[in-house]
Structures are given as C-alpha cells and as structure tokens.
C-alpha cells in the first residue's frame, strides 16, 4: 500500500486519536448488590462516562485491543467491624475473557483497616486505591470486587470509582 | 477542506502531541495556609513542572478541554491526633467552573489515620492517593484539600504532591 | 525539509505512537533481596510486559525521553511488628542518572501500619500506592524501595507492581 | 476570650474519692483536647493524662490507671478529673489545661483546685 | 518514660542581663523535622502559662525577650533581658510520647 494508504491510516490514527478509549464509572446506591457479584457502577450521570469502551452487569467491556491504565478507588468505613479487628478487605480488579472460565485477578489490595476502631462504637474510615496497566483484548471485561463489601461507603460518586484509558 | 486541510490538522495534532498536557506540582513549606483555602504548590523548582496547563493559586489551569486523568498525593503525619481517633482526614480533589459558583467535588477520600498511633507510641504516619479521569473545559480549574490540613506533613515534594495529564 | 520530510515524521510519529513506551512489572518470590538493594520484579511472566521500556537489577530503564506517569504498589503484611507497633514503612519510587552518583528520591510514601494490629499477635494487611509525573532522560533508571521490606508480602503478581508509561 | 473554670478547693480523707470539674468558655470545646496536670508541694508538674470532648476517648499517665477517671458533658461545655483511693501524697493542686491548636502543648489552664488529703 | 533534666535548678540574673536554661530529655523528641518541646512559666499562685512551643515558637502575647532553640535532646529557654515580672519557676514539657513529662522546674530570681 503506497502514500494513500499511509495517509488513510493517517487520517484513521488522527480519529481514533480523538477517541482514545477512556471511562470513569462512579458509585452508586445500586452498586452494592449483596450478591456475590462484582459492584455495578453509574455509567452516565454526573462525572460517570464511557467513550471508546462499553459497560455490561458491572464490567468495563473492551472494544480495541491494547494496554490500558485501569484503576479503582474503594471507599471504607463504619461503626466497628462486623468481624471485630480481624476484619480484612480484599478490593481487586478482575479480568473475565472468553478464553478462559474463571475470572483472573489483575491488581489486588488487602486491608485490614478495623485496627483503627477500638472498640463497636468506633467510626473509621478508610480508603483502598489500585491502579496498573495491563493488556486487553476486544471483548473482554474488567470488574471490581470488595469482600467484606458491607464495608463499602457509597456517598455520591466522588469516594467509590472504577475507570481506564489506554496508554 | 481537502487533503491540504487534512494534512494542516495532521501538522497541527503531531505539534499538539508533543505538548500532550501534563503536570506535577509539589509540596513545599508554603502549602498550607491554614487560611481554609486550597493547598499551594510548587510549580518549577526540582520535580515539579507544567506543560500545557498553567497553574493560579493553587489550582491547575486547564488550557484545553479534554478527558484529564488527574491525581494526588498526601502525606499525613504527626504526634497523635487534634480529636484523638475521632479524627477524620478528607482529601479531595475539586473543580472550580465559571459556570457555577460552587466547588465541585471531583474525587474525594475519607480516612481515620490516627488509630494508628498506639499507646506506646504517639507518632503515626498515613498516606491518602487519589487519582481518576474527569473531563475539563478550557478556563476550569482542579485544586486539592485537605481538611484537617495540620495532618499534612510537608518535606522536599516527593510526598504530596498534584498532577494531571490528558488522555 | 519539505512536506516529504514533514510526511516522514509523520510516519515515524505513528510507528513510535504505536509503541507508547509502558511497562508493568509483577512482585515475585525473588522480589526481596534482604540486600539493602530495591525491590526485583519480573517482567515477562503472567500480567508482566516491557514495551519500549528495558530493565536491569530490578530498574526500569529509559530509552525514550519523556514525562512518565510511573506507579508502584506494595502490599504489606504482618503478624505483630519486627519494631513494635511504632513501625514506620517507607515506600518510595527512586530516580537513577549517569549525571549524579546518588539515587534521587521521586515519589515517597510513610505509613505506620502496625497501629492496625492491636496485639504482637494480630494479622494485619495494608497496602501502599504512589503515582505520578516525572521527567525521565534516555538511560536514566527507576526503582521501588521500601523500608522495612520485611513488611512487604508477595503472592502472585497481583497485590505489589511496579510500572510505568508515557503520557 | 477563652475561659477554664475549675470548682473549689476539697480536704477528703484518705481512701476516699475526689471529682474536679472545669467548665470551659470562649472557644468550640469539642475542638480542643483537655489534659490534667498536678503539683504538689514542693515537686514539679506531673501530667495525668487527657480527654478529648469530641468523643470522650481517655488517654491516662499509667501511674495513675484505675485511680483517674476523666469524664465530659458536652451539654455544659465542662469536663471532670475524678481520683480514687485518694492517699496523703495525692495532695496537690489539680489543673485543666486545653490543648492547643498544634494539640500538644497546654495553652490556656484553669486557676486549680486544691486537694488535700488527710485523716 | 522520657526523662527531662533541666539546669540550673535555680538562676539569680540581674535586671537586664540574660538568663538561660538548658532542658536535656533522655531520648530524642524530634518528629519529621519539628521538635516536640515546650516551656512553661509559674508564678506562686498562678497555673502555668505557655512561653513556647514547638521549641522555637513563641506564643501569642509572650514578649519577644523569651525564646527558644535546640533539637533532638537538648535544649534552651533564653530570657535576652530580665525583668521583675520574669521571676518564676520555668519548666520544659515534653509531648513526643506519654505520658507527657517535665522537667523539675528552674527558680528564676535576681541577683
């Protein structure tokens, strides 16, 4: 393919530039399920938005193949700890790929922030951010997960968040 | 407009990637004003810099829109705590728009760092990171609090610090 | 030079933007030294990669100029504390230059994190994240220290990383 | 202006037991710590320990754990010192201090309250 | 327990001369730069009142013929020139650690 080719996958680079994939999803009152599944996230109102990604059940949904920053910020906190001091949090970001059944850990934090109240009556706060970059394919997706999620503050989309942009 | 147009708008975005805006600013001994206003930055000396943003009072001048993922970091320290384990650190990064009056929250943390200094020892240190993709207009501007700011420990930049970068 | 050589540039531009330099680097068994040096990452296996970016002794190395967003997490763990509870860690991602003999602090992080562990027998987590911009020259290195390593727990690549790209 | 009232001198007799109170005014009590710090005669000044009105959390000088009990009525803006199984050398004068704005040093004190224990 | 040893045990200054005490604590008191030490003035009859803090930082109201140095474990309360209404027992405070503990007092007087 001679200079016209060139320039057509100059002028497609210059809009798909335009476009880099990009999305910040922020929490909800819906985001807790209680059900074992990942969070689910505000895809459109406020800060939320999706451009060149989509979003299914939960999931960031790749739609070009390539690296990407993602990153999540979990909000913690209560009035003592349902497990008293022993209480962890595991707050991760997973990949499901239809190449595989189980969901594959990508970026992983434990936390153990219950040693900061003393005693049942005690208000803490704490907060779990995680962020890399790493590899997708089309058509994969990317969760959030909390155990213990009961730990998990939902206020107004500003505290809880999941999002990627390719790099 | 033809290929010559094209081939200005190439011209122009291959000079506009090379400025891909970008900034760090970093803490310095001037940064809490104890005023109620936003923290200061350092803005040229050692590692900080700005490219393509400009900075005023704080804040980080957006010179054109985009999505921006922005960031900071805090570094919470002292001899125990002004309300003992009671007291609760927010940090948070916000938007100032011609189009409304008020700050806009952005990206928020919540933390109780002071349950970390024990009964043996009163000095603890905690650390607060924010980051996440928001969209800025020309003209907007982002600043970071910290509410209670006498937790911040200011040293040589490398431990709080503000940055941005379009996506 | 003509627009022949501007259209060269041009080429040359989206071949390199193709290679946006990035690297992410995974915590491994071999990770801690109990050297006194950084951190060792691995750097092909599972969600390991380099592009455009090489690595020695544990350094991501530059060979393209630029502004670098570069991250680092550790997961710290522990029963009790080696120091008692007023165990302060320091994380920090180091700047190493042909152009001075000592590293150079870029981004550094101090948690106290045994105040989470009420008892010299209690389980504690924590985890710790830094990111941010910086200037890197071809050639110049970049590396994660933390102190006390004996705090760091590594498992499988997910919870302590190490990367990097051009922004 | 900032204000710490302390109530009035006690004579108790060994054994028994003594409550100080000291009313703040002039400031946001939830705000600022209150410590306890004693003189007795003819020895320095010897901290007891502190309180902080916003919660009612407690941190006590081990010498005097189990014996001092320090307490808040927020409602009323003051707190209480209170020592048990009061000896002869608990004679002193007792003194509120208010943490300062940095918390750790005593800006302003109440005038004191003497306490003398004896059969 | 942080031990805090101050010297002289007392002082006689004439009026307008300097005086200056030295407060020695058994373990550092420094964190992240900034000394955790403090001096305190007691007249008979009187609570303590706050001179400094932090070491070097006078506090409000204080005259500025009172200051304060040092670092780590040694330190100084200067009085550049003694007045009558400076007569009075002074004492450092440490607040690094609990329980907060001071000095043994130094009697001020005039010569």
């Known amino acids: 393919d001679g200079p016209a080719g060139s320039w057509e996958q100059l002028i497609q680079e210059r809009r798909s530039h335009e476009v880099n994939p990009a999305a910040h999803l922020t929490g909800a009152n819906s985001s807790l399920t209680g059900s074992g599944g990942p969070l689910l996230w505000e895809t459109q109102l406020g800060l939320a938005f999706l451009r060149g990604l989509s979003y299914h059940d939960g999931a960031l949904v790749v739609t070009k193949a390539g690296y990407y920053y993602i990153y999540s910020k979990v909000q913690l906190g209560g009035v003592g700890c349902p497990l008293g001091l022993a209480s962890t949090i595991t707050h991760g970001l997973y990949k499901r790929t239809p190449r595989y059944p189980e969901e594959l850990e990508l970026l992983v934090s434990q936390q153990s922030p219950c040693g900061r109240a003393t005693s049942s009556s005690r208000v803490w706060w704490d907060s779990s951010f995680l962020g890399g970059v790493v590899h997708l394919e089309a058509g994969e997706e990317v969760v959030v997960r909390v155990l213990d999620e009961r730990l998990v503050r939902l206020r107004d989309g500003t505290r809880s968040y999941f999002g990627a942009f390719m790099v | 407009d033809g290929p010559a147009g094209s081939w200005e708008q190439l011209i122009q975005e291959r000079r506009s990637h090379e400025v891909n805006p970008a900034a760090h600013l970093t803490g310095a001994n001037s940064s809490l004003t104890g005023s109620g206003g936003p923290l200061l930055w350092e803005t040229q000396l050692g590692l900080a810099f700005l490219r393509g943003l400009s900075y005023h009072d704080g804040a980080l001048v957006v010179t054109k829109a985009g999505y921006y993922y922005i960031y900071s970091k805090v570094q919470l320290g002292g001899v125990g705590c002004p309300l003992g384990l009671a007291s609760t650190i927010t940090h948070g990064l916000y938007k100032r728009t011609p189009r409304y009056p008020e700050e806009l929250e952005l990206l928020v943390s919540q933390q109780s760092p002071c349950g970390r200094a024990t009964s043996s020892s009163r000095v603890w240190w905690d650390s607060s990171f924010l980051g996440g993709v928001v969209h800025l207009e020309a003209g907007e501007e982002v600043v970071v609090r910290v509410l209670d700011e006498r937790l911040v420990r200011l040293r040589d930049g490398t431990r709080s610090y503000f940055g941005a970068f379009m996506v | 030079d003509g627009p022949a050589g501007s259209w060269e540039q041009l080429i040359q531009e989206r071949r390199s933007h193709e290679v946006n330099p990035a690297a992410h680097l995974t915590g491994a068994n071999s990770s801690l030294t109990g050297s006194g040096g950084p951190l060792l990452w691995e750097t092909q296996l599972g969600l390991a990669f380099l592009r455009g970016l090489s690595y020695h002794d544990g350094a991501l190395v530059v060979t393209k100029a630029g502004y670098y967003y570069i991250y680092s997490k550790v997961q710290l763990g522990g029963v009790g504390c080696p120091l008692g509870l007023a165990s302060t860690i320091t994380h920090g991602l180091y700047k190493r230059t042909p152009r001075y003999p000592e590293e150079l602090e870029l981004l550094v992080s101090q948690q106290s994190p045994c105040g989470r562990a009420t008892s010299s027998s209690r389980v504690w987590w924590d985890s710790s994240f830094l990111g941010g911009v910086v200037h890197l020259e071809a050639g110049e290195e970049v590396v994660v220290r933390v102190l006390d390593e004996r705090l760091v727990r590594l498992r499988d690549g997910t919870r302590s990383y190490f990367g990097a790209f051009m922004v | 202006q900032v204000q710490l009232v302390q109530s009035g001198a006690e004579v108790k007799k060994p054994g028994a037991s003594v409550k100080v109170s000291c009313k703040a005014s002039?400031?946001?009590?939830?705000?600022?710590?209150m410590n306890w710090v004693r003189k007795a005669p003819g020895q320095g000044l010897e901290w007891m320990g502190r309180i902080y009105p916003v919660s009612g959390e407690t941190n006590y000088n081990q010498k005097f754990m189990g014996r001092a009990t320090f307490t808040v009525d927020r409602s009323t803006s003051t707190v209480y010192m209170e020592l048990s199984s009061l000896r002869s050398e608990d004679t002193a004068v007792y003194y509120c201090?208010?943490?300062?704005?940095?918390?750790?040093?005593?800006?302003?004190w109440g005038q004191g309250t003497l306490v003398t224990v004896s059969s | 327990d942080i031990v805090m040893t101050q010297s002289p045990d007392s002082l006689a200054v004439s009026l307008g001369e300097r005086a200056t005490i030295n407060c020695k604590a058994s373990q550092s008191v420094d964190f992240d730069g900034e000394s955790y030490m403090n001096w305190y003035q007691q007249k008979p009859g009187q609570p303590p009142k706050l001179l400094i803090y932090?070491?070097?930082n006078l506090e409000s109201g204080v005259p500025d013929r009172f200051s304060g140095s040092g670092s780590g474990t040694d330190f100084t309360l200067t009085i550049s020139s003694l007045q009558a209404e400076d007569v009075a027992v002074y004492y450092c405070q440490q607040s690094i650690e609990d329980p907060w503990t001071f000095g043994q007092g130094t009697k001020v007087e005039i010569k």
């Open positions: 932090s070491a070097s």
């Open positions: 002039g400031y946001t009590f939830i705000d600022h710590i």
């Open positions: 201090g208010r943490g300062s704005y940095y918390w750790n040093a005593m800006d302003y």
